[in-house]
């Protein structure tokens, strides 16, 4: 999906207003020191194409977060504030129902969440310079 | 205060399309979104989409897409929402809705008086 | 059939209490999602009640208050009046992508006997 036509401003403020409250819960317990962000984005598309990658896409030790609240609500902002995002993940969402596991927080999914704090922040200041 | 005065009472054949008009005043219109949202007789409300009064960006719910177009005038501070292909049951009110929250996530703050759009052969 | 469940109708006498249930499922309202209220008096547009489970708009009188706990919200009223028989609507979103994101109860018809 090409989220370049997507409402950035208001994705922005659903993530302030929910999506990254319910990161901060997700990683309770866990020192921010914790975790080195090795994950980057250059601009508010490709933040969120990363953002979708990382949420919704299953990784080693890390199986599935697409039941969290804060991916459940990352997907309905993308799908509000995004044109015809809706259609492209249709498809994309029954193949991984059939992949789906058990919910397990292991370390490497709060690794994955503190780097999709660190995409989410970085979504949230679009004019800074990459580093 | 927030108006939103929307065109009258339609009557269609089915297959025929229909053209809504919303005009808004009492606040400045390209500051909002607008949603357009019907309500089926002894029914709940159901979302339909949103336009951007400012930039003129859409999204359409999927049950509406490829029968539902929203455009906007902002020289005369109106929403239109035209839905083509009519079927009876697609008699409804057909209400827009100002957006409220800066939470962003839709909230229907405002509310026009609706117009009633019937599909009967 | 909607997406959230309300009961079709209640009823209560002047100056009581009554409340009004909308049930949906951890796709949306179990998802943590905000949900909100609105009131439509016969022959009427929707009016915003409640907004973001618990907060009133401005005009809106102290009687009429909201909750959410696990899947389900509730709306209550105290102090029943003539002037609250409507039809009361909960709203919320709604993470499947097959339906509307945007989603409507089915509505609760309140009369004031």
């Known amino acids: 999906y090409d989220f370049t036509n997507c409402d950035f401003e208001k994705i922005k403020a659903a993530y302030l207003s929910t999506i990254s409250k319910d990161l901060i819960t997700y990683m309770s317990g866990t020192k921010s020191t914790e975790f080195n962000n090795t994950v980057s984005c250059s601009n508010r598309p490709h933040c969120l194409t990363e953002i979708q990658s990382l949420t919704f896409n299953p990784t080693a030790g890390c199986a599935s977060l697409a039941k969290e609240m804060f991916a459940m609500k990352t997907k309905a902002a993308l799908a509000i504030w995004c044109p015809g995002y809706s259609e492209t993940q249709i498809n994309a969402t029954q193949a991984m129902k059939k992949r789906r596991k058990r919910k397990v927080t292991t370390n490497k999914c709060l690794e994955q969440v503190s780097q999709l704090q660190g995409l989410w922040r970085r979504f949230n200041r679009p004019l800074l310079k990459q580093q | 205060q927030v108006q939103l005065v929307q065109s009258g009472a339609e009557v269609k054949k089915p297959g025929a399309s229909v053209k809504v008009s919303c005009k808004a005043s009492g606040y400045t219109f390209t500051d909002y979104y607008m949603y357009w949202v019907r309500q089926a007789p002894g029914q709940g409300p159901e979302w339909m989409g949103w336009?951007?009064?400012?930039?003129?960006?859409?999204n359409y719910v999927q049950k509406f897409q490829g029968r539902v177009t929203m455009t906007r005038d902002t020289s005369i501070s109106t929403a239109y929402m035209e839905l083509s292909r009519m079927r009876s049951d697609d008699t409804a009110v057909y209400y827009c809705?100002?957006?409220?929250?800066?939470?962003?996530?839709?909230?229907?703050?405002?509310w026009g008086l609706g117009t009633l759009v019937t599909v009967s052969s | 059939q909607s997406v959230l469940t309300q009961p079709p109708s209640v009823s209560g006498a002047p100056g009581q209490r009554v409340t009004i249930s909308c049930t949906g499922s951890s796709s949306n309202i179990g998802a943590g999602f905000d949900v909100h209220w609105y009131q439509q008096l016969p022959g009427t547009a929707p009016k915003l009640l409640i907004y973001?489970?618990?907060n009133r708009p401005s005009g809106v009188p102290d009687r009429f208050s909201g909750s959410k706990s696990g899947t389900s919200a509730s709306l209550a009223i105290t102090g029943l009046q003539a002037e609250d028989e409507a039809d009361y609507y909960c709203q919320s979103y709604d993470s499947n992508l097959s339906g509307s994101i945007v989603v409507f109860g089915g509505g609760t018809k309140l009369t004031v006997l």
């Open positions: 973001d489970n618990n």
């Open positions: 336009i951007n009064p400012n930039s003129g960006g859409t």
């Open positions: 809705a100002r957006d409220g929250g800066s939470s962003g996530w839709p909230l229907f703050a405002y």
